[in-house]
């Protein structure tokens, strides 16, 4: 008789999740010599321990603490790039500008990027059928708690000038309910962070509006200013040219506004 299984509203654990996490860990430690001491089997065991046999609506930051310890890493605090709803461009940028880091450029972020996972209470099984949806089921699910934990700590680590890439094509360029808006903004440390600089990425070829005047950007500025952090904003009118100029800053066309 098949055992009754809780049906959640979200997609189930990513296929071959254990193998994927382990393979990503090995690849990351090969690419980053400073992390070659990391024992990827221990990393997987700690990751698994955070959610296996636990109710997937009752996960805490504490569950991920063993994994956090194993993911200890040097991140230059003044080279942090946050992003919201524009992950691909942010990652393209840090692939070129190698001294800057998004969360997904760290081991922990790299391991979990684009993956879904959850377990079941009192069994050692991974649930590949369904996992809790943040809105429809519960917010304290394994994926949401993981990203909240690492995002909070990534923001806490930032200093000096922190950059954030925002999607100018969205109706809410700054969304208070995004991870950036609900977690990272509130965990920047005013004694360490001098300025938050927003880069608003334009979508349309002919879009010459100043999106730094958008009401949601003004809302972000207000939140940041109240936290005693300075705010600045730049329009990136041509993201393709922006990336090209990061690659080749000497190019004569890169002196004009991008």
């Amino acid at each position: 008789v098949p055992r009754w299984r809780q049906q959640w509203s979200g997609p189930g654990t990513t296929k071959r999740f254990p193998e994927t996490v382990l393979a990503r860990c090995v690849k990351y430690t090969e690419i980053h010599p400073e992390m070659r001491h990391v024992d990827c089997q221990s990393v997987w065991d700690a990751f698994k321990g955070a959610f296996i046999s636990k109710h997937p609506c009752n996960i805490t930051e504490e569950d991920y603490q063993p994994l956090m310890k194993l993911g200890t890493q040097t991140v230059p605090c003044n080279k942090i790039l946050l992003w919201s709803r524009i992950k691909d461009l942010a990652h393209q940028f840090t692939q070129v500008q190698r001294d800057m880091f998004t969360l997904e450029d760290t081991l922990l972020g790299y391991l979990a990027d684009d993956l879904t996972w959850c377990g079941e209470f009192n069994t050692s099984k991974i649930n590949y059928q369904s996992c809790p949806d943040w809105r429809k089921d519960c917010s304290n699910n394994p994926v949401s708690v993981f990203w909240k934990t690492v995002s909070r700590r990534f923001a806490e680590a930032a200093c000096d000038v922190v950059h954030v890439m925002l999607n100018g094509s969205r109706s809410k360029i700054f969304d208070k309910n995004s991870t950036f808006g609900s977690v990272e903004v509130h965990n920047l440390q005013p004694e360490k962070v001098q300025t938050l600089e927003a880069w608003v990425i334009h979508g349309g070829r002919e879009d010459s509006r100043d999106l730094c005047q958008d009401p949601t950007i003004k809302e972000l500025e207000s939140i940041i200013s109240k936290r005693n952090i300075q705010f600045s904003c730049k329009n990136i009118y041509r993201p393709d040219k922006f990336l090209q100029c990061v690659k080749n800053p000497e190019d004569s066309s890169c002196t004009s506004e991008i």
Epitope: M68, K69, G71, T72, Q73, T74, V75, P76, C77, N78, T106, L108, V150, R153, F154, E156, A157, C159, Q189, E191, K192
Partner: nanobody
Framework: EVQVLESGGGLVQPGGSLRLSCAAS????????MSWVRQAPGKGLEWVST????????DYADSVKGRFTISRDNSKKTLYLQMNSLRVEDTAVYYC??????????RGQGTLVTVSS
């Protein structure tokens, strides 16, 4: 600007003890969790211990649990690490850092601990 200065390292025999200190400035020390991390020769960064801002909560790596004790004196803006029963594998440069990790950008020069007979 956050600044830290570690001291107290040295050469010690296996089984011996050392007390590391970290003098901090440029931020409200008591508001921040503080950590010790270490880097052994040719190895990566390893988290050692963290203490909460108030000092009432501590956490240790399994490899040092029961041998090392982290503490702080907020009035002196100083972080400590008492290291007992030292082993050869504890040889490393020890850094203090603000925050609880896992992402660290240590600001000090560190202090070298060498455990050798």
């Amino acid at each position: 600007e956050v600044q830290v200065l570690e001291s107290g390292g040295g050469l010690v025999q296996p089984g011996g003890s050392l007390r590391l200190s970290c003098a901090a400035s440029g931020f409200t020390f008591s508001s921040y969790a503080m950590s010790w991390v270490r880097q052994a020769p040719g190895k990566g960064l390893e988290w050692v211990s963290t203490i909460s801002g108030s000092g009432d909560s501590t956490d240790y790596a399994d490899s040092v649990k029961g041998r090392f004790t982290i503490s702080r004196d907020n009035s002196k803006k100083t972080l400590y690490l008492q290291m007992n029963s030292l082993r050869v594998e504890d040889t490393a440069v020890y850094y203090c850092a603000d925050g609880r990790g896992p992402f660290f950008d240590y600001r000090g020069q560190g202090t070298l601990v060498t455990v050798s007979s």
